[in-house]
């Protein structure tokens, strides 16, 4: 599914992908929040920025994709497919798969989806902030 390894992507290309992911993450979170009475859980943590947070490896794309793929097993909002496709563009071909256990309890499923969706949306905000501040530093 990878046309080019991620290290061939220009910083501007990465920024476009992250901008798109930010927009999609907001859509996902908006829909997930329609399910009233579900609370965020402290049991799940989505990895976000890499230690250096520099392009091309600005975010933990393989781990984030693994979490989104887990959500995809539980939920068929088509925006999730699109998010996964965009994350694919930010992943090295040899990236190892992260294993995530799927919640089995109905309510816990909903909490997992809400928690990860919220963290993913926040993560995309952080990633974009990091990219834009990095781009500003590069031009000064």
């Amino acid at each position: 599914s990878h046309t080019l390894p991620v290290h061939f992507l220009q910083p501007s290309d990465i920024q476009k992908i992250v901008e798109e992911l930010q927009s999609l993450s907001k859509m996902l979170l908006k829909d997930v929040k329609e399910d009233k009475g579900v609370l965020v859980s402290q049991n799940y943590t989505l990895p976000c920025l890499t230690p250096d947070a520099q392009p091309p490896n600005i975010i933990h794309s393989p781990a984030i994709r693994a979490y989104l793929k887990t959500i995809r097993q539980l939920d068929n909002k088509s925006v999730i497919d699109e998010i996964i496709e965009h994350l694919d563009k930010l992943i090295f071909q040899d990236a190892p798969e992260t294993n995530i256990s799927v919640p089995t309890d109905t309510h816990e499923c909903k909490r997992f989806i809400l928690t990860i969706s919220q963290q993913f949306s926040e993560c995309m905000d952080l990633a974009l902030k990091s990219l834009t501040s990095g781009a500003q530093q590069a031009t000064t």
Epitope: M27, K30, D31, E34, D35, R72, Q73, L74, D75, N76, K77, S78, V79, I80, D81, T106, H107, C109, K110, I113
Partner: antibody
Framework: QSQLVESGGGRVQPGGSLRLSCAAS?????????ICWVRQAPGKGLEWIVC?????????YYAPWAKGRFTISKDNSKNTVYLQMNSLRAEDTATYFC???????????????WGQGTQVTVSS | AFQLTQSPSSLSASVGDRVTITCQAS??????LAWYQQKPGKPPKLLIY???KLASGVPSRFSGSGSGTDYTLTISSLQPEDFATYYC??????????WGFGTGTKVTVL
């Protein structure tokens, strides 16, 4: 009591067009489910046509054979989903059902809801 | 293209018999499978969803099992009102699979 009511069926000549409506009552068009059109020709099985997502984006998915001639749309203010059918052929003669399907595997059976169907006959 | 293969297409059985209907998907559908019963002139009635969950009001003689690509509907002891046509359906959604129905299994009196 949640229900779906189809209307707009009838007799139409080959090559003609028809617009079916699926009105939802007892629930609102908020996020997290799909509304689909399914048809059943006389004495035949169920055949999926198209689905539309009720959420922040009106994503649509068509059966490959339905692309081009059939178009799904929705009007949130009227809580209604439509199926526009063009260039109708004799083989489109069927009962057309609209149905609501869950978006989450964790959802309960109440998310599955079918209308009674509307009859479409394509004949000269 | 994605396909759901249901078998058998028809079967004859007697009241009290155990009946098994299978549904095979051409790719994994992660348990996004429902089973319906349909009688002439009526819309389908949900029996099983999420591959194995019994819909409310459905008798416990109906059960569903399976995962990945292979799924089964079992009627443990066929009753007179169970003579009907049964369909499996995936509601996985998304662009890679979409929705779809099995070809149906007509259960008639032996």
């Amino acid at each position: 009591q949640s229900q779906l009511v189809e209307s707009g069926g009838g007799r139409v000549q080959p090559g003609g067009s028809l617009r079916l409506s699926c009105a939802a009552s007892g629930f609102s068009f908020s996020a997290n489910y799909w509304i689909c059109w399914v048809r059943q020709a006389p004495g035949k099985g169920l055949e999926w046509i198209v689905c539309i997502y009720i959420g922040s984006r009106a994503d649509t998915y068509y059966a490959p054979w339905a692309k081009g001639r059939f178009t799904i749309s929705k009007d949130n203010s009227k809580n209604t989903v439509y199926l526009q059918m063009n260039s109708l052929r004799a083989e489109d003669t069927a009962t057309y059902f609209c149905a609501r399907f869950s978006s989450g595997i964790y959802d309960l059976d109440r998310f599955f809801l079918w209308g009674q169907g509307t009859q479409v006959t394509v004949s000269s | 293209a994605f396909q759901l293969t249901q078998s058998p297409s028809s079967l004859s059985a007697s009241v009290g018999d155990r009946v098994t209907i299978t549904c095979q998907a051409s790719q994994s559908i992660d348990s996004w499978l429902a089973w319906y019963q349909q009688k002439p002139g009526k819309p389908p009635k949900l029996l099983i969803y999420q591959a194995s969950k019994l819909a409310s009001g459905v008798p416990s003689r109906f059960s569903g099992s399976g995962s990945g690509t292979d799924y089964t509907l079992t009627i443990s002891s066929l009753q007179p009102e169970d003579f009907a046509t049964y369909y499996c359906q995936t509601y996985y959604g998304g662009g890679h699979i979409g929705w779809g129905f099995g070809t149906g299994t007509k259960v008639t009196v032996l």
